[in-house]
Interface confidence: low
């Protein structure tokens, strides 16, 4: 339905509060280095303009597209060239090229200071002094650090952030009330950002078809009682929502997400029996709840898949008539029967089925050719099962920290050219799969583990894309979305790598390590481990373990010493010498 003024339409649909919040998120995700005050000024100007359009949709410029209006506003920033360099060239382009140009300059790893949490009393004072500014700052800081954060979901996080401060700043022990909530929001926020980043990468790098296939598989697992036409409708709508958000069209995205939640709740009887509680919640909570809802029970007595997809004489006819619909039905039928499989495994099976039909439907005897297609699935299913079993055994044996270290060594040997901070961040996240997924029964391990690994490996891919240093990473990241994890798993030690020269400075530590949190201290040690492997890629596990044990003892000893700094200087030299000898450096 066409509207005379798109900006007025969205303002009316979303309401002033959400409109302003979403425009702030959009601007902060585009211009990640701009000061908070500059963004607030731009948002206020856009909001005032929107109000004039609500009053009179025929007013001057009200008929312009949102990209034109927002792009024009961003291009008024005086310091654009000195702050952003070549991004300023985007302003010379016309829409839609200008928006595409802004999108290409989004930075997954912006050079921004680490967010340090102030004292609780300081935060509570700031919250009470100016609640609106306090919450806007939260949106701004998250959005600029996570330029693909799912905007309507960020509104939900902001609502919870506000609720935490409202409750805890009145509590007797403010810190005990507030800090766990902020930790939870931070951890959930990082996870939410990473999951959305994969959705955007899927759409932008592999196209709408890839995203739709993912959505068919996931929604069919979640809503196995829904019929194929219903799942297809949900997939189409969900694809539109995520395409909009990933494309920077945050107002349209939030509006369409609300419409989708409304549709799902109005039709929950034909979708899932698990939606009742979600649908009783307010809008932001409702949308979040639906996105996280547990899988419905599988219908009883589902017939064998073989009848329609192998035994039927009409397989090639049905495939030829509407290839994507037929493959979509295959994926739907397979996924609804297999909540125990990861989405990426289901997509690999569908790809194998498609490849087989492409080959066999052109053969002399198609049925004879594809009759054994399901046998080809067995090794595809067993590979992730075995990998998860082996890694969960290793995790249970080592615990999370040492399991992360094993992965650090493994991945540094595979792709030693990747920067140390990226290897540490990605390997630490890969290692979290153990505590996240290994405690669960067989039926829940694979969807938990492999789909989580897809999210983490996508972090590696987007960080590497910014500064490509390894052909092997580029290959695994770009060849196939669903085979990324098997591709990385299959990588062996990079024999072409020339070891890094030894630099004693890398292994020089100071007393400040003693005041770090346990997590930060682990990161310091893991950074040293990566550097060791880069210096000596052929070092054995035993050699590395010995050096790391010595290092841990050295830190512990010096942190207990009266003169810590002297201890670190003197004992550090000894440790470096002993490590060089142990590793033959």
């Amino acid at each position: 339905d066409a509207h005379k003024s798109e900006v007025a339409h969205r303002f009316k649909d979303l309401g002033e509060e959400n409109f302003k919040a979403l425009v702030l998120i959009a601007f902060a995700q585009y211009l990640q280095q701009c000061p908070f005050e500059d963004h607030v000024k731009l948002v206020n100007e856009v909001t005032e303009f929107a109000k004039t359009c609500v009053a009179d949709e025929s007013a001057e410029n009200c008929d312009k597209s949102l990209h034109t209006l927002f792009g024009d506003k961003l291009c008024t920033v005086a310091t654009l060239r000195e702050t952003y360099g070549e991004m300023a060239d985007c302003c010379a382009k016309q829409e839609p090229e200008r928006n595409e140009c802004f999108l290409q300059h989004k930075d997954d790893n912006p050079n921004l200071p680490r967010l340090v949490r102030p004292e609780v009393d300081v935060m509570c004072t700031a919250f009470h002094d100016n609640e609106e500014t306090f919450l806007k700052k939260y949106l701004y800081e998250i959005a600029r650090r996570h330029p693909y954060f799912y905007a309507p979901e960020l509104l939900f996080f902001a609502k919870r952030y506000k609720a935490a401060f409202t409750e805890c700043c009145q509590a007797a022990d403010k810190a005990a009330c507030l800090l766990p909530k902020l930790d939870e929001l931070r951890d959930e926020g990082k996870a939410s950002s990473a999951k959305q980043r994969l959705k955007c990468a899927s759409l932008q790098k592999f196209g709408e078809r890839a995203f739709k296939a993912w959505a068919v598989a996931r929604l069919s697992q979640r809503f196995p009682k829904a019929e194929f036409a219903e799942v297809s409708k949900l997939v189409t709508d969900l694809t539109k929502v995520h395409t909009e958000c990933c494309h920077g069209d945050l107002l349209e995205c939030a509006d369409d997400r609300a419409d989708l939640a409304k549709y799902i709740c109005e039709n929950q009887d034909s979708i899932s029996s698990k939606l009742k509680e979600c649908c009783e919640k307010p809008l932001l909570e409702k949308s979040h709840c639906i996105a996280e809802v547990e899988n419905d029970e599988m219908p009883a007595d589902l017939p064998s898949l073989a009848a329609d997809f192998v035994e039927s004489k009409d397989v090639c006819k049905n495939y030829a008539e509407a290839k994507d619909v037929f493959l979509g039905m295959f994926l739907y039928e397979y996924a609804r029967r297999h909540p125990d499989y990861s989405v990426v495994l289901l997509l690999r099976l569908a790809k194998t089925y498609e490849t087989t039909l492409e080959k066999c439907c052109a053969a002399a005897d198609p049925h004879e050719c594809y009759a054994k297609v399901f046998d080809e699935f067995k090794p595809l299913v067993e590979e992730p099962q075995n990998l998860i079993k082996q890694n969960c055994e290793l995790f249970e044996q080592l615990g999370e920290y040492k399991f992360q270290n094993a992965l650090l060594v493994r991945y540094t040997k595979k792709v030693p050219q990747v920067s140390t901070p990226t290897l540490v961040e990605v390997s630490r996240n890969l290692g979290k799969v153990g505590s996240k997924c290994c405690k669960h029964p067989e039926a829940k391990r694979m969807p938990c583990a492999e789909d989580y690994l897809s999210v983490v490996l996508n972090q590696l891919c987007v960080l590497h894309e910014k500064t490509p240093v390894s052909d092997r990473v580029t290959k695994c990241c770009t060849e196939s979305l669903v085979n990324r994890r098997p591709c990385f798993s299959a990588l062996e030690v990079d024999e072409t790598y020339v070891p890094k020269e030894f630099n004693a400075e890398t292994f020089t530590f100071h007393a400040d390590i003693c005041t770090l949190s346990e997590k930060e201290r682990q990161i310091k040690k893991q950074t040293a481990l990566v550097e060791l492997v880069k210096h000596k890629p052929k070092a054995t596990k035993e050699q590395l373990k010995a050096v790391m044990d010595d290092f841990a003892a050295f830190v512990e000893k010096c942190c207990k010493a009266d003169d810590k700094e002297t201890c670190f200087a003197e004992e550090g030299k000894k440790l470096v010498a002993a490590s060089q000898a142990a590793l033959g450096l």
Epitope: A176, D183, E292, E294, K436, H440, P441
Partner: nanobody, 124 residues
């Protein structure tokens, strides 16, 4: 590493009540979402109830809503499950679980730590 120890299980007649307790040690209890799950003989483990860090949110499986109540006392590092109007189908091993971070309270794979379980038998 968080350790969880359940207690309070036993044999009870249909319509009766029990109160299960789960004592936690080894971690900052108030930073964990706590949940109860159960597993009947020959069946899969299923979600029963969960409670957020500061008791703001509670979640229940449809089958126990109105009969079971989850609560926690952060000062005692303990989570409770009050079971009322018990039915034979409530017979199961009841597990306590802790999750440092969860976006989905009802999914057992979101929980990082598990107790050994306490047996509840409802029989006349």
């Amino acid at each position: 590493e968080v350790q969880l120890v359940e207690s309070g299980g036993g044999v009870v007649q249909p319509g009766g009540s029990l109160r299960l307790s789960c004592a936690a040690s080894g971690g900052t209890f108030s930073t964990y979402v706590m949940g109860w799950f159960r597993q009947a003989p020959g069946k899969e483990r299923e979600f029963v109830a969960a409670i957020s860090q500061n008791s703001i949110h509670t979640y229940y499986a449809d089958s126990v809503k109105g009969r079971f109540t989850i609560s926690r006392d952060n000062s005692k590092n303990t989570v409770y499950l009050q079971l009322n109007s018990l039915r034979p189908e409530d017979t199961a091993l009841y597990y306590c679980a802790a999750s440092r971070f969860t976006s989905w309270y009802t999914a057992d794979y979101e929980y990082d730590y598990w107790g050994q379980g306490t047996l509840v038998t409802v029989s006349s």
